[in-house]
Interface confidence: low
C-alpha cells in the first residue's frame, strides 16, 4: 500500500471540523499580473502581497500594481497600494526587506524614461505608512542593506555609480564611480570592484578591488588585476589575473583586504569559472570548473586559513549554461551535505557526505521502493535527489530538497530509485536521520512545508488540474490525512509559510478561472487546534546523531564530537510552539588522523590515513609553493579540519618542515597597496 | 558485575615476547575502550595504548611503538597485549582497564574498571 | 609529551585530617584530569573524572577541582582505609600520562 494508508495510522480525531473553523479566505478582486509575496520580520504576522510587471510592458493593459498587507500570517488582507500612490513597482526589484527585525521594506518604482533618477517607496514600520523619495540616480540593482545598519542602504546605479545612504534612503551620496560590483561586509565595510578603462565587461580581469570602511569617506585598493570577488564566513575570495597568461587564481583574505594568500587551487581559462558553494566561519566549499564545457568540475574543501583544499569531490554536476547546481547544505543535520556528479555515462547521480565533504558515497536505497529502468541489478541501487538542475530541467519537480535547522534530522526532496536521477514522475522520500535512511512519504510529485519545527509536514500535489485538497502528517510523514479546504477547486500556484518552520499556518494561493475571469485567491490555514497541547518532556526522547551503532565508542563522531538531541516522538501529536529550541548536548571525541587533513606539500596515500611529504611539487602546488605566504610553507604537515573539536587521542606532532627551501616569491606587492582619501 | 581478568604470571627470557590477555565480563565488551597501563616495581603508573573493541583500531604510546600489539577477540571478550623484544626493564605489573564511557557531556576518558594485574618478569 | 608534577610525593596524617595532594600539569589540558587510588598489591581505581566529577560508588569526601594547569584532589576527613597512593593523569593530549604519585601515609 501507498505509505501512510495503513490501517493502524494514527489518524487525528475530528481533523476535519478543527480545520474548518481555521480556514480563511481571501480573495484579491483585482490583481494582475505576477504576484509577490514578502514576510516582514519575524514572528509578526505581517505579510505584503505585490503585483509587479517587467518593464518594458504595455502597462496600460493592466492597471497599476497593487500592495497588500496582513497581519494575522495571512488569514486577512488590506489593500494598501494608495500607500505607494498606485505606482508601478518593478518585478526585478521586488521588494526589499530589511535585516532582522528591523520593520524595513524598500519598493523600488517605475518612473517614466525623462525622469532624473528612479524612485522608491520606504517604510519602517512594518510596511503601516510610506514614504515617498525621488533618487538622483537611476538604479541597477536592487537596495542593499548593511547587515549590520539597517539604515545603511548601498545601490548601483545604471551609471555604474556607487550610491550609499546613511539615512534609510532618504538623501543619498555617490561615493564611486565605475562601479561594476559591490558587497557588504562586516563592521559596515564595503567592498567593490572598478574598471579603468572602458567598462565592467571590457576590463574584466583588469579590475580593482576596493575597500571603504567609513562609508566613502576613504578607500584602500586591495587588489588589481581582480576578475570577480565573492564573500564567504570570514573569508573574502579574489580570482587574480596571472601575469604571464589568460589563467586566474584565488587569492584569500580573512583579514578584509589588507593581506592576501594565494590558495592552493588549480587555476582557470577564460571559460571556466569558480563558485563558492558554501561558507561557514570554519571553511568553504570551493567548486573549480574542468577546462571545456564539461558541465562538471571538482569540489575542493579548505583549511581553516582558507588556503590549504582537499580533494573532496569529482565530477561534480554544475552546469555553464543555466549556472545550475544540485548543491545542497541540510541544515537539518550538522556536517551532511547532498549534491550531484556526472557519472562517465553522462547519467546524474545522487551523492551525500556526513562529515563536511570528506567522504561522499551514495544514498542509501529507501526500504519500501523497487529499483527503476535505470538499476541494472533490480536488487542494489540507491536513492536520486532531484534539485536545481531537474528543475532547470523542466522535470516534474515543484520543489527543491527541504530541511530545516529546528526540524532536527528531517529531510524531504523528490527523488528516484535506481542507478541515476531518471526522467520519470518522482516520489517524494523523507529522511529523519539526517540522510542516512529513506523513506518514500507520498507517491508522485507534490509541494512540501514543515510546520512547528517538523511537528507538521504538509503537502499538496502537483498537478495540472485545479485542487481543493491539501494533505498533512504528525508524524514525519508516516501516515498522511487529507483535508478539503475548499468546495471549488482553485489552479494552485503556490504554498507560503513563515520562513524558520516554526509557525503553524500556511497559506494556499491560486487562482479561480470562470469563462471570463480569473481571480486571485489565497487560503491560510492555522494548524493549533490539530495540536491541541503544548509538548511536555514525556512527548520527546533522545535521539544520537550520525549514529548507526549506539554501543560503538566512537560511533558518530563528526568533526571531533558527536550530539545527543531531544526529539519529539513520531506518536506525540502537541505543539512544540513558536519558541521552541533545539535541545542538544555534545560530547567530545578523542582525535585520530581522520581529524586532521594534511597541510600544504602533505597527501595521504591510498587507505592511509597518514600525511606523507609530496617529493616534487608540480602544477598548482608548485604555484603555491612559489607565490604563497612564508609562513603557510612552514608545516608538520598536518592541521586540524576546520570546526573539528576532537580533544586528546591521536596528537601527529613532528618535526615542522620548512617548504620555502624548495621555492620562493609573494603575491600582492606592498606597491600595490595604495591607500587615498575621497 | 563488570569485571576484567587478566592471564597468570609470566616469566620471560630477554628477546622474548609475551603476551596477556583480559577477559571482560558484566557489559557490552565492544562499546568501552581498552587501555593497557604498566607499573614496574615501586614506580608510578605508565599508559602504554588502547584499542577500541569494535573496530580494532589501536593507539599507541610512542614509547611502545614498533613493540606492543593490542588485538582482540570480540566473541569471547577478550583483549590481548603482546610485547615482543622484552628486556629487563620491561619488568612490571601488567594491567588492562576500561576506558570510562563518554555518555553525553565530554568526560575525560577516566579508566573506570580495572583488571587484578599480570606480573611479568624479564630475566635471563 | 605533557609532564604531570604531583606535589607531595608523600604525606603523613591522622585519620579526620583534610588533606590536599595538587597536580600541575606542562601546559593546560583543560578539565581532562582524572584521579586514582591505589593501595599495595591491587590496582587503582578511578575516583575523579573530568578534574571535579565523582565517580560513582566513592565516597563523598573525595573532591576535586581546578583546571588549566593547577588541579586539587581534596580528602575534607582522612579514613582508615584512605592510605593508599594517588595519581593524577590526564587525557587531554595522546600520550596519557599520569603524575609520579602521592604517598599518603599513617602519622
Known amino acids: 500500500s501507498a505509505p501512510g494508508e495503513d490501517e493502524e495510522c494514527g489518524r487525528v480525531r475530528d481533523f476535519v471540523a478543527k480545520l474548518a473553523n481555521n480556514t480563511h479566505q481571501h480573495v484579491f478582486d483585482d490583481l494582475r499580473g505576477s504576484v509577490s509575496l514578502s514576510w516582514v520580520g519575524d514572528s509578526t504576522g505581517v505579510i505584503l502581497v505585490l503585483t509587479t510587471f517587467h518593464v518594458p510592458l504595455v502597462i496600460m493593459t493592466f492597471g497599476q500594481s497593487k500592495l497588500y498587507r496582513s497581519e494575522d500570517y495571512g488569514k486577512n488582507f488590506k489593500d494598501i497600494t494608495d500607500l505607494i500612490n498606485n505606482t508601478f513597482i518593478r518585478t526585478e526589484f521586488g521588494m526589499a526587506i530589511g535585516p532582522e527585525n528591523s520593520g524595513k521594506v524598500v519598493l523600488t518604482a517605475e518612473v517614466s524614461g525623462g525622469s532624473r533618477g528612479g524612485r522608491i517607496f520606504r517604510s519602517s514600520d512594518f510596511a503601516k505608512n510610506f514614504v515617498q523619495t525621488d533618487l538622483p540616480f537611476h538604479p541597477l540593482t536592487q537596495m542593499m542593506y548593511s547587515p549590520q545598519n539597517s539604515d545603511y542602504l548601498l545601490a548601483l546605479s545604471t551609471e555604474n555609480g556607487l550610491w550609499v545612504s546613511k539615512n534609510f534612503g532618504g538623501k543619498w551620496e555617490e561615493i564611486h564611480k565605475a562601479v561594476c560590483l559591490a558587497k557588504w561586509g562586516s563592521d559596515n565595510t564595503i567592498f567593490f570592484t572598478t574598471y579603468a578603462n572602458g567598462s565592467c565587461k571590457a576590463d574584466l580581469g583588469a579590475l580593482e578591488l576596493w575597500r571603504t570602511s567609513d562609508l566613502g569617506k576613504s578607500f584602500k585598493t586591495i587588489g588589481v588585476k581582480i576578475y570577480s570577488f565573492g564573500l564567504g564566513g570570514r573569508f573574502l575570495f579574489a580570482s587574480v589575473m596571472a601575469d604571464k597568461d589568460t589563467t586566474r587564481r584565488i587569492h584569500v583574505s580573512t583579514d578584509q583586504g589588507d593581506t592576501w594568500s594565494m590558495a592552493q587551487l588549480p587555476s582557470v581559462g577564460q571559460e571556466q569559472f569558480y563558485s563558492i558553494l558554501a561558507a561557514n566561519d570554519d571553511m568553504v566549499f570551493m567548486h573549480v570548473d574542468e577546462p571545456g564545457d564539461t558541465g562538471f568540475g571538482t569540489i575542493f574543501t579548505s583549511d581553516d586559513r582558507g588556503i590549504v583544499y582537499s580533494k573532496s569531490l569529482d565530477r561534480h554536476l554544475y552546469t555553464t549554461t543555466g549556472g545550475e547546481t544540485d548543491f545542497t547544505n541540510v541544515t537539518s543535520l550538522r556536517g551532511v551535505y547532498i549534491t550531484s556528479v556526472l557519472s562517465e555515462d553522462n547519467s546524474i547521480q545522487t551523492m551525500i557526505t556526513f562529515d563536511q565533504g570528506g567522504r561522499w558515497t551514495h544514498l542509501r536505497k529507501p526500504e519500501n521502493s523497487e529499483c527503476d529502468a535505470t538499476a541494472k541489478n533490480k536488487n542494489e541501487c540507491s536513492l536520486h535527489i532531484h534539485a536545481s538542475y531537474s528543475i532547470s530541467q523542466k522535470l516534474n519537480v515543484p520543489m527543491a530538497p527541504l530541511s530545516e535547522p529546528n526540524a532536527v534530522g528531517i529531510v524531504i526532496a523528490h527523488g528516484s530509485v535506481g542507478d541515476a536521477i531518471s526522467v520519470m514522475v518522482p516520489d517524494v522520500y523523507i529522511s529523519d536521520d539526517g540522510g542516512y535512511s529513506w523513506t518514500k512519504m507520498l507517491e508522485g510529485p507534490h509541494y512540501y512545508t514543515i510546520l512547528d519545527s517538523g511537528g507538521i509536514i504538509v503537502a499538496i500535489e502537483h498537478s495540472s488540474r485545479p485542487i481543493n485538497v491539501i494533505k498533512f502528517s504528525t508524524d514525519e510523514g508516516q501516515c498522511w490525512q487529507t483535508y478539503t479546504f475548499t468546495r471549488d477547486p482553485i489552479y494552485f500556484t503556490g504554498l507560503a509559510s513563515e520562513p524558520g518552520a516554526r509557525s503553524m499556518n500556511i497559506s494556499i494561493w491560486g487562482f479561480t478561472e470562470s469563462f471570463l475571469t480569473s481571480q486571485w485567491v489565497s487560503y491560510t490555514i492555522d494548524f493549533k487546534d490539530i495540536l491541541e497541547r503544548n509538548c511536555e518532556e514525556k512527548d520527546y526522547t533522545i535521539w544520537a546523531a550520525h549514529s548507526t551503532d549506539p554501543e560503538d565508542y566512537e560511533d558518530g563522531c563528526i568533526l571531533g564530537y558527536k550530539e545527543q538531541f531531544l526529539r519529539l516522538r513520531k506518536s506525540s501529536v502537541c505543539q512544540n510552539g513558536r519558541d521552541y529550541v533545539v535541545t542538544k548536548q555534545p560530547s567530545i571525541c578523542l582525535c585520530s588522523l581522520e581529524d586532521f587533513l594534511c597541510d600544504f606539500g602533505y597527501y595521504r596515500p591510498e587507505n592511509d590515513s597518514k600525511c606523507v611529504e609530496q617529493p616534487e611539487l608540480k602544477g598548482h602546488d608548485l604555484e603555491f609553493c612559489l607565490y604563497g605566504r612564508e609562513e603557510h610553507l612552514t608545516t608538520n604537515g598536518y592541521r586540524k579540519i576546520p570546526g573539528d573539536k576532537c580533544q586528546g587521542g591521536v596528537n601527529p606532532v613532528r618535526e615542522v618542515k620548512d617548504l620555502k627551501k624548495k621555492c620562493t616569491s609573494n603575491f600582492l606587492s606592498p606597491e600595490k597597496q595604495n591607500s587615498k582619501s575621497n | 558485575q563488570v569485571q576484567l581478568v587478566q592471564s597468570g604470571a609470566e616469566v620471560k627470557k630477554p628477546g622474548a615476547s609475551v603476551k596477556v590477555s583480559c577477559k571482560a565480563s558484566?557489559?557490552?565488551?565492544?562499546?568501552?575502550?581498552m587501555h593497557w597501563v604498566r607499573q614496574a616495581p615501586g614506580q608510578g603508573l605508565e599508559w602504554m595504548g588502547w584499542?577500541?573493541?569494535?573496530?580494532?583500531?589501536?593507539r599507541y604510546a610512542q614509547k611502545f611503538q614498533g613493540r606492543v600489539t593490542m588485538t582482540r577477540d570480540t566473541s569471547i571478550s577478550t583483549a590481548y597485549m603482546e610485547l615482543s623484544r622484552l628486556r629487563s626493564d620491561d619488568t612490571a605489573v601488567y594491567y588492562c582497564?576500561?576506558?570510562?564511557?563518554?555518555?553525553?557531556?565530554?568526560?575525560?576518558?577516566?579508566?573506570?574498571?580495572w583488571g587484578q594485574g599480570t606480573t611479568v618478569t624479564v630475566s635471563s | 609529551d605533557i609532564q604531570m608534577t604531583q606535589s607531595p610525593s608523600s604525606l603523613s596524617a591522622s585519620v579526620g585530617d583534610r588533606v590536599t595532594i595538587t597536580c600541575r600539569a606542562s601546559q593546560s589540558i583543560s578539565s581532562y584530569l582524572n584521579w586514582y587510588q591505589q593501595k599495595p598489591g591491587k590496582a587503582p581505581k578511578l575516583l575523579i573524572y573530568a578534574a571535579s566529577s565523582l565517580q560513582s560508588g566513592v565516597p563523598s569526601r573525595f573532591s576535586g577541582s581546578g583546571s588549566g594547569t593547577d588541579f586539587t584532589l581534596t580528602i575534607s576527613s582522612l579514613q582508615p582505609e584512605d592510605f593508599a597512593t594517588y595519581y593524577c593523569?590526564?587525557?587531554?593530549?595522546?600520550?596519557?600520562?599520569f603524575g609520579g604519585g602521592t604517598k599518603v601515609e599513617i602519622k
Open positions: 593523569q590526564q587525557s587531554d593530549v595522546s600520550p596519557i600520562t
Open positions: 584499542i577500541n573493541p569494535n573496530s580494532g583500531a589501536t
Open positions: 582497564a576500561r576506558g570510562k564511557r563518554s555518555s553525553g557531556w565530554y568526560e575525560g576518558y577516566g579508566m573506570d574498571v
Open positions: 558484566g557489559y557490552t565488551f565492544v562499546a568501552y575502550y
